[in-house]
Amino acid sequence: KAMHVAQPAVVLANSRGTASFVCEYASPGKATEVRVTVLRQADSQVTEVCAATYMMGNELTFLDDSICTGTSSGNQVNLTIQGLRAMDTGLYICKVELMYPPPYYMGIGNGTQIYVIDPEPCPDSD
């Protein structure tokens, strides 16, 4: 079987605009270096949200200005996306690439629909 990437179908961001989901992959080989990319698909446009390469057993390291954080455990990656607003609602797709050792393998999940609801502004108090 080809490498399978699983992720939840739907996630609701919390009131602070943070959404978390698990991206799990069935590995056809013993990878020591894995690249995880989060892609956002909305209105048939696909954009890269964030990406991280990690060594198995080590933490994921996203760029300093990334809106993503994450941890890994075996073939499972726990991803958190922060700073989301209602306009960021969309399908967030997890792409996993086994970078080392060769051969390279790629797997793409079906996507997690993340719903973001902007909080109501607090009424002014006298």
Epitope: A2, M106, I108
Partner: antibody
Amino acid sequence: QVQLVESGGGVVQPGRSLRLSCAASGFTFSSYVMHWVRQAPGKGLEWVAVIWSDGRNKYYTDSVKGRFTISRDNSKNTLYLQMSSLRAEDTAVYYCARSGIALAGNAFDIWGQGTMVTVSS
Amino acid sequence: DIQMTQSPSSLSASVGDRVTITCRASQSISSYLNWYQQKPGKAPKLLIYAASSLQSGVPSRFSGSGSGTDFTLTISSLQPEDFATYYCQQSYSTPFTFGPGTKVDIK
């Protein structure tokens, strides 16, 4: 417009070396995975090598491992293929190609026009 | 390595015909299969990616289907400019192998 232009091809004797270049324009070269693909006269397409955007990860087809080296200079928007210990069976048109579709992985959406390499004594 | 096979290796057809080309992978590649068109002396052109997604600018008479090991490229109504050689390619694992090609010529 988005363009890839190969250069550096020519006639070379067996055992000699040659370096191909591929100049990219019209897109942010440093963000894309790049490949070399070749086609022997009258034959089909053969993938040769790939290099990731940061230049750290590279893979090759078995027949060129240890003889060919793929590299890139993101500051010059240029992809390279250093070919050494050339053999007659390396004779082909060499194309550089871009992986430009995130959800397709390594599908080649932009191709250069190709440069011909002939290995002959 | 994943081997790719195509059938037929060549076919003759007339303008307006419906043409179907099949591609088979030696192991499951999910939907990581792409189709290219190549005309003599020219670089290949991407038609279909991820088995069934039409590349921007490609006419809608081209369509792709399949997953796992068996894939199909269909040209619903062959046009004069479609006479060319068609290649499938897997992008699941290195080496990113191509099929041997299918040449479509005029009957």
